[in-house]
């Protein structure tokens, strides 16, 4: 109960990581994160 956690993301495909509450698809190279996804394994909003 006391240990830290490094949650992995069990999502289809690659490039998902925990951003905020959810596992989100990261932004492509050259883009930056505007907003994280709002559902499990969702797409971040990138600019």
């Amino acid at each position: 109960q006391g240990g830290t956690r490094s949650p992995r993301c069990d999502c289809a495909g690659d490039f998902h990581k925990k951003i905020g509450l959810f596992c989100c698809r990261g932004c492509p190279a050259g883009h930056y994160l505007k907003a994280p996804c709002t559902e499990p394994c969702g797409n971040s909003t990138c600019l």
Epitope: T4, R5, P7, T38, E39, P40
Partner: antibody, heavy 122, light 111 residues
């Protein structure tokens, strides 16, 4: 022993403000996402705010967006809920809840405090 | 928002029998291979207690007489055999998307 203890509830007039606190112990607070959930006696539970661990993203339902602000102080192992522009419908028992840990985020809430009561009335 | 409808609202079950509680979602709560439904038990004057997460996973310390099943929009919590201490209100919750919502609750009484 994992423990979360809420405080700060009370009687406030409509339009007023209140700040709730939740003191956590028995686990590495900074590693867990946290939520506030409220309940009108004998009624449905309503999730009102969440904050992520590490990057501190915050989330709210439309019913409280712009009026409530969730925050955390990992150094003090404390979660907060700043409530403003309070309405009579915000009257409820407010629970602090830890999101379940594990290999990946699951968003179930595994430890809850006893709650702190908020009454909005003139 | 996803609406969770629980049935029945309340019922009574004899000691040792099976109790079945239904939770129906207004849209699918399944994605990425998981069904994002969780079950809680709440007794009067106490906070909710997590029983089952992700539809069928028993939380640590919860007796094996509790089980969960379902997929898509229809989910079930089973308690068998029912014991006196199981008298409580049971809630389902989804985490498929924001906002997280809870069912309206099912009150279980023991005969």
């Amino acid at each position: 022993e994992v423990k979360v203890v809420e405080s700060g509830g009370g009687l406030v007039k409509p339009g007023g403000s209140l700040k709730l606190s939740c003191a956590a112990s028995g686990f590495v607070f900074s590693s867990y996402d946290m939520s506030w959930v409220r309940q009108i006696p004998e009624k449905r539970l309503e999730w009102v705010a969440a904050i992520s661990s590490g990057d501190y993203y915050t989330y709210y339902p439309d019913s409280v967006k712009g009026r409530f602000t969730i925050s955390r102080d990992d150094a003090r192992n404390t979660l907060y809920l700043q409530m403003s522009s309070l309405r009579s419908e915000d009257t409820a028992l407010y629970y602090c809840a830890r999101h379940r840990g594990g290999n990946y985020p699951q968003y179930a809430m595994d430890y809850w405090g006893q709650g702190t009561s908020v009454t909005v009335s003139s | 928002d996803i609406l969770l409808t629980q049935s029945p609202a309340s019922f009574a079950v004899s000691l040792g029998q099976r109790a079945t509680i239904s939770c129906r979602a207004s849209k699918s709560v399944s994605t990425s291979g998981y069904n994002y439904i969780h079950w809680y038990q709440q007794k009067p004057g106490q906070p909710p207690k997590l029983l089952i997460y992700l539809t069928s996973n028993l939380e640590s310390g919860v007796p094996a007489r509790f089980s969960g099943s379902g997929s898509g929009t229809d989910f079930t919590l089973n308690i068998h055999p029912v014991e006196e201490e199981d008298a409580a209100t049971y809630y389902c919750q989804h985490s498929r998307e924001l906002p997280f919502t809870f069912g309206s609750g099912t009150k279980l009484e023991i005969k």
